[in-house]
Interface confidence: medium
């Protein structure tokens, strides 16, 4: 992994995790009845929901071949394979889609080899005794005077690479999407490369993660494409790579809307929701953790 | 000093290719995102091509597409465009222009620095 | 491709006098515009980007205004040195389409 030095690994899971292979996340989809029933709400993004001893095991069973083809994250985040993607996305469960297919940024140590292993970009810092918790790769600096979470994001060195983020602003880079998340404290997201233009859905791009994915008028986007296709499916216009998490975008030409053709196993709109059919029962006040 | 300098224009005959250079100096050229644009005798401005600052991602006007190929070396500060299939209706002064790439976190746009230009004369 | 037009082409003004150009975008591009003035002879130089951003070192009598498919320069009170051909460029595609130019000449 060749992360930047400072140069964060994009947002993350919703909870603290190290660098390890098990994040554990006492808060997570807890249910207070006596049964913990395994469903696609408690254990997303292709992991399988296992009994563990006294608990409940999110298992991430992804064995990603090591082919470098790389695929830029809506996190920031390069990956060294779409695989790798995946797993990450299970790992830290949170919903990670392709934007791009090769990097995110080409400069040396600007991109992260496998983006998971650099820890999740909402990682929460622990020494926060006058901070609160510093989210988002930001330190907390006791000593200062007016004291707060400091970021020490360096994006200087980086080349132009225009992305337009969930807030709605276009940055000159995706490190400055990481740096912005750091300095406001919030979770901001890439959701396409290139700078937002007037055809982005600005009702998504407003709003905070919401789980809600970039997802432009599609009918302006697809007057874009060169190609012109006479049938009534078409592929998606490249802006809407990643809109189908596990399956294939098409968009249908007479109702101008992009649909997804979800690979076998899984379903929701976006196929991002994994079909499950056993239920798992265990004792109550037991915590639910992913590996 | 930040400049741009382009160079290998001329007289071409139809049909016949050409390169231009242009030369950077006075800022990092690596980071920043760089385009050519043309201006005929006489008439306005026409954007031709722009490549990113990684040389992976390029975008052409319609008229040059096919024919026209723009890249760059960033181990020499320098931007080319490679013109095949040169006809008349290319004459033009070609201008080489940095991408507006700014100080801050947020994408500005525009050209913030052109070159002199170079010209292009493409007769029989 | 996004086409945009200029108006008026030619404008005849005087020293001290305030000026408006206008362009119009054939669709929307938020405010993904920029002004450039360009003399004789001369490479273009950047006046205004996103709409209505100042580029750093141009006179503060020169301004921008508009966005979706309506914007104007504005130059408050004209001095000898602003007389010279103006044009708009729009960047909201991946396909830069500049207006055709306003010639700004001495009444």
């Known amino acids: 992994s060749n992360q930047p030095p400072g140069g964060g690994g994009g947002s993350g899971g919703d909870c603290p995790g190290g660098k390890g292979k098990s994040i554990n996340c006492s808060e997570l989809n807890v249910r207070e009845s006596d049964v913990r029933v395994c469903d696609e709400s408690s254990c997303k993004y292709g992991g399988v929901c296992k009994e563990d001893g006294d608990g409940l095991k999110c298992a991430c069973q992804f064995q990603c071949h090591t082919n470098y083809i790389p695929v830029c994250g809506s996190n920031g985040d390069t990956y060294q394979n779409e695989c790798f993607l995946r797993r990450a996305a299970c790992k830290h469960q949170k919903e990670i889609t392709v934007i791009a297919r090769g990097p995110c940024y080409s400069d040396n140590g600007s991109g992260s080899g496998e983006g998971e292993e650099e820890g999740s970009g909402a990682e929460v810092h622990r020494k926060h005794s006058k901070c609160g918790p510093c989210k988002y790769k930001a330190e907390c600096d006791e000593d200062a005077e007016n004291v707060g979470c400091v970021c020490n994001i360096d994006c200087s060195g980086y080349s132009f690479n225009p992305v337009c983020a969930s807030d709605g602003s276009s940055y000159n880079n995706p490190c400055f999407v990481r740096e912005a998340s750091c300095i406001k404290q919030e979770q901001i997201d890439i959701r396409h490369l290139g700078h937002c233009t007037d055809t982005d859905d600005t009702s998504l791009l407003g709003k905070k993660d919401d789980g809600l994915q970039y997802r432009p008028d599609v009918k302006d986007a697809s007057d874009q494409r060169e190609d012109v296709y006479i049938g009534n499916h078409m592929p998606c216009p490249e802006n809407l790579n990643g809109y189908c998490i596990h399956g294939k975008c098409e968009f249908i030409y007479s109702t101008q809307k992009a649909s997804c053709r979800c690979e076998s196993g899984y379903t929701g709109q976006h196929c991002e929701k994994t079909d499950f059919s056993i239920l798992y029962v265990v004792p109550s006040r037991q915590k639910l953790t992913h590996v | 000093q930040v400049l741009l300098v382009e160079s290998g224009g001329g007289v071409v005959q139809p049909g016949r290719s050409l390169r231009l250079s242009c030369a950077a100096s006075g800022f990092t050229f690596k980071r920043y995102g760089m385009h050519w644009v043309r201006q005929a005798p006489g008439r306005g401005l026409e954007w031709v091509a722009v490549i990113w600052s990684d040389g992976n991602k390029k975008h052409y006007a319609d008229s040059v597409k096919g024919r026209f190929t723009i890249s760059r070396d960033n181990s020499k500060n320098t931007l080319y465009l490679q013109m095949n299939s040169l006809r008349a209706e290319d004459t033009a002064v070609y201008y080489c222009?940095?991408?507006?790439?700014?100080?801050?976190?947020?994408?500005?746009?525009?050209?913030?620095?052109w070159g002199q230009g170079t010209t292009v004369t493409v007769s029989s | 491709d996004i086409q945009m037009t200029q108006s008026p082409s030619t404008l005849s003004a005087s020293v001290g006098d305030r000026v408006t150009i206008t362009c119009r975008a054939s669709q929307s591009i938020s405010s993904w515009l920029a002004w450039y003035q360009q003399k004789p002879g001369k490479a273009p130089k950047l006046l205004i980007y996103?709409?209505?951003s100042l580029e750093s070192g141009v006179p503060s009598r020169f301004s921008g205004s508009g966005s979706g498919t309506e914007f104007t320069l504005t130059i408050s009170s004209l001095q000898p040195d602003d007389f010279a051909t103006y044009y708009c460029q729009q960047y909201n595609s991946y396909s830069w389409t500049f207006g055709q130019g306003t010639k700004l000449e001495i009444k």
């Open positions: 996103k709409a209505s």
């Open positions: 222009a940095r991408e507006n790439y700014g100080s801050g976190s947020y994408y500005n746009g525009g050209m913030d620095v």
